[in-house]
């Protein structure tokens, strides 16, 4: 009983429960394929507990293995639209620091209008994750269609 | 050593490890787009540890941030079937209490026969999750093709 | 404070944080539909903390409920390729011990070139997971396109 109480009194941060779920804010300017994210209770059901946003990109605050997940849906899209505008590709990667730059997750839309995936990956404090959408189609900003998140899993 | 033993003796519920994985039971009557779920060891590999089923819908018992995941495959489906019967859409949302009603996750099948996705979302005790399949195609009842689950991640 | 320190000094294994993320090594010989996996820091961002590889297949070392996830992308693939070579199917299951053999997760590619999904499932120490890719198309070996992992969630 005392242990359970003690555990509840611990700051969650000391348990390493870093977690974030983001919604799309906007796409980048002309030559910038990055998606820009936003999060926080004022925006709906998105949140950041530990990680932070740096100019719309997600920055990690705690070393560890993370589950990274994403769903992106293309706006006003049909299978005809998707195949006509192929290739449209989504890549999630570490974009800074430059020394750690790597693609973590990559998917093409082909004849579909939504991609969704997830993976486990080691991330370090200071890693910034970027989500690059290449192609000529816009992502939906509906919060139930396009979202991006991370969950700390273990050291 | 003593700490590890103490931890194992704690009820899991006090650690907040609520988790459920459900299999499809049946679809709803004519005007009801909801899928009805079932779970428990007698049924195979589905289970409920914390959350409960209320008339085939999943009810949350512990406040927190949850990972919600789902896969739905359409029955006797080909890409031709899927595109012919488009739009077929799956939405996961909070359907009660009505004051908290919101769509959490939405996907269309387009020319595919399976959708699968996952997201992090805050849920509160008493929230009931509904999964609405709109369209004229049946979901597969095979337990490796259609399933729905939640996992408590943090308070 | 003392509790937090004590917790950090515990071996992670006693907390049950078994986790693995694997990358594709190679496909099987002629009549063997299994994918053969590899993992470890020398290979990039793949790792095994708890589970082990047994001839390229993932073996579980701790009883519990696991989140199993996978993404497989077909090599040099377009929607035309995928539909022309249909059916191409990916199944994840317990392949040994034989007494516990079962399919956990199954997806067809239809007109798409990537499948990605995840599910919660109980696994026992000694369970070996196999991933069977049936069809005549090769999986991509790019580490951001094809990967397979498990995460221990609770006892």
């Amino acid at each position: 009983q005392r242990f359970a109480q003690a555990q509840q009194q611990l700051p969650l941060e000391s348990l390493g429960w870093d977690v974030a779920e983001l919604q799309l804010n906007h796409t980048g300017p002309q030559q910038d394929p990055r998606l820009y994210w936003q999060g926080g209770p004022a925006l709906g059901r998105s949140f950041l507990h530990g990680p932070e946003l740096d100019k719309g990109q997600l920055r990690i605050h705690r070393d560890g293995i993370y589950m990274v997940h994403i769903q992106v849906t293309l706006a006003i899209c049909s299978s005809t639209t998707a195949s006509r505008h192929h290739p449209t590709t989504l890549a999630v990667g570490i974009c800074s620091p430059a020394s750690r730059s790597i693609s973590l997750l990559r998917l093409s839309f082909h004849q579909g209008c939504t991609i969704a995936s997830q993976r486990l990956t080691p991330l370090a404090r200071g890693d910034t994750l970027c989500t690059n959408l290449t192609g000529t189609l816009l992502p939906s900003r509906n919060t139930d269609e396009t979202f991006f998140g991370v969950q700390w899993v273990r050291p | 050593q003593r700490f590890a033993q103490a931890q194992q003796q704690l009820p899991l519920e006090s650690l907040g490890w609520d988790v459920a994985e459900l299999q499809l039971n049946h679809t709803g009557p004519q005007q009801d787009p909801r899928l009805y779920w079932q779970g428990g060891p007698a049924l195979g590999r589905s289970f409920l540890h914390g959350p409960e089923l209320d008339k085939g819908q999943l009810r949350i018992h512990r406040d927190g941030i949850y990972m919600v995941h789902i896969q739905v495959t359409l029955a006797i489906c080909s890409s031709t079937t899927a595109s012919r019967h488009h739009p077929t859409t799956l939405a996961v949302g909070i359907c009660s209490p009505a004051s908290r009603s919101i769509s959490l996750l939405r996907l269309s099948f387009h020319q595919g026969c399976t959708i699968a996705s996952q997201r992090l979302t805050p849920l509160a005790r008493g929230d009931t999750l509904c999964t609405n399949l709109t369209g004229t195609l049946l979901p597969s009842r095979n337990t490796d093709e259609t399933f729905f689950g939640v996992q408590w991640v943090r308070p | 404070q003392r509790f937090a320190q004590a917790q950090q000094q515990l071996p992670l294994e006693s907390l049950g944080w078994d986790v693995a993320e694997l990358q594709l090594n190679h496909t099987g010989p002629q009549q063997d539909p299994r994918l053969y996996w590899q993992g470890g820091p020398a290979l990039g961002r793949s790792f095994l903390h708890g589970p082990e590889l047994d001839k390229g297949q993932l073996r579980i070392h701790r009883d519990g409920i696991y989140m199993v996830h996978i993404q497989v992308t077909l090599a040099i693939c377009s929607s035309t390729t995928a539909s022309r070579h249909h059916p191409t199917t990916l199944a994840v299951g317990i392949c040994s011990p034989a007494s516990r053999s079962i399919s956990l997760l199954r997806l067809s590619f239809h007109q798409g070139c990537t499948i990605a999904s995840q599910r919660l499932t109980p696994l026992a120490r000694g369970d070996t997971l196999c991933t069977n890719l049936t069809g005549t198309l090769l999986p991509s070996r790019n580490t951001d396109e094809t990967f397979f992992g498990v995460q221990w969630v609770r006892p």
Epitope: - | A75, R84, H85, T136, L137, L138, S140, R141 | -
Partner: antibody, heavy 119, light 111 residues
């Protein structure tokens, strides 16, 4: 309530063609497919073909070369045409549909059109 | 094409007794966790009336004395207790793939 009403001929000469219209009410042809089934003493119940919600068709391979199914969504009408009729095409022809799911089982049927092929 | 074989071709049952009709498919009509086998009742001068769909689901308005069972290739329609209005011809039908096919029918008469 959902209804399927058939119009069409009685007697048809051998080698002539058959045309039947199925007019539906209380549902949209843009949501459900309409199937055609015939029944004869010799062959029993036989599925002939379907026109799906998107206008695409599937036919019984044995009759494919002789069948044509089209529709006019705005008029809620489906048109069944069969060429080169022979005496063994004598049957009652039905249009039919499912209730909620667009698979081939049929809670709803038209009243049937009796077609007799004879010289 | 999948061939459906019904037996018996005809049967006579007393009021209140059980009628059992069998339908065997030349290959499995099961897929995706369902068996795509359905049962109809037909009376002279009327189109077939759907009784049971997907092996065991009672169509709305159909009395509970009708029930269906089976899986894979072997299916059964049971009527119990048989009532006077049940005298008719009964057909099984599959929709596992195209073309859907029907059984030749079983004629139920009352003793």
């Amino acid at each position: 309530q959902v209804q399927l009403k058939q119009s069409g001929p009685g007697p048809v000469q051998p080698s002539q063609s058959l045309s039947i219209t199925c007019t539906v009410s209380d549902f949209s042809l843009t949501i459900f497919g309409i199937h055609w089934v015939r029944q004869s003493p010799g062959k029993g119940l036989e599925w002939l073909g379907v026109i799906w919600r998107d206008g695409s068709t599937d036919y019984n391979v044995a009759l494919m070369s002789r069948l044509n199914i089209t529709k006019d969504n705005s008029k809620s009408q489906v048109f069944f045409k069969m060429n080169s009729l022979q005496t063994d095409d004598t049957a009652i022809y039905y249009c039919a549909k499912n209730r909620r799911y667009d698979y081939a089982w049929f809670p709803y049927w038209g009243q049937g059109t009796l077609v007799s092929v004879s010289a | 094409d999948i061939v459906l074989t019904q037996s018996p071709a005809s049967l006579a049952v007393s009021l209140g007794q059980r009628a059992t009709i069998s339908c065997r498919a030349s290959k499995s009509v099961s897929a995706s966790g369902y068996s795509f086998l359905h049962w109809y009742q037909q009376k002279p001068g009327q189109p077939p009336k759907l009784l049971i769909y997907l092996t065991s689901n009672l169509e709305s308005g159909v009395p509970a004395r009708f029930s269906g069972s089976g899986s894979g290739t072997d299916f059964t329609l049971n009527i119990h207790p048989v009532e006077e209005e049940d005298a008719a011809t009964y057909y099984c039908q599959h929709s596992r793939d195209f073309p859907p096919t029907f059984g030749a029918g079983t004629k139920l008469e009352l003793k």
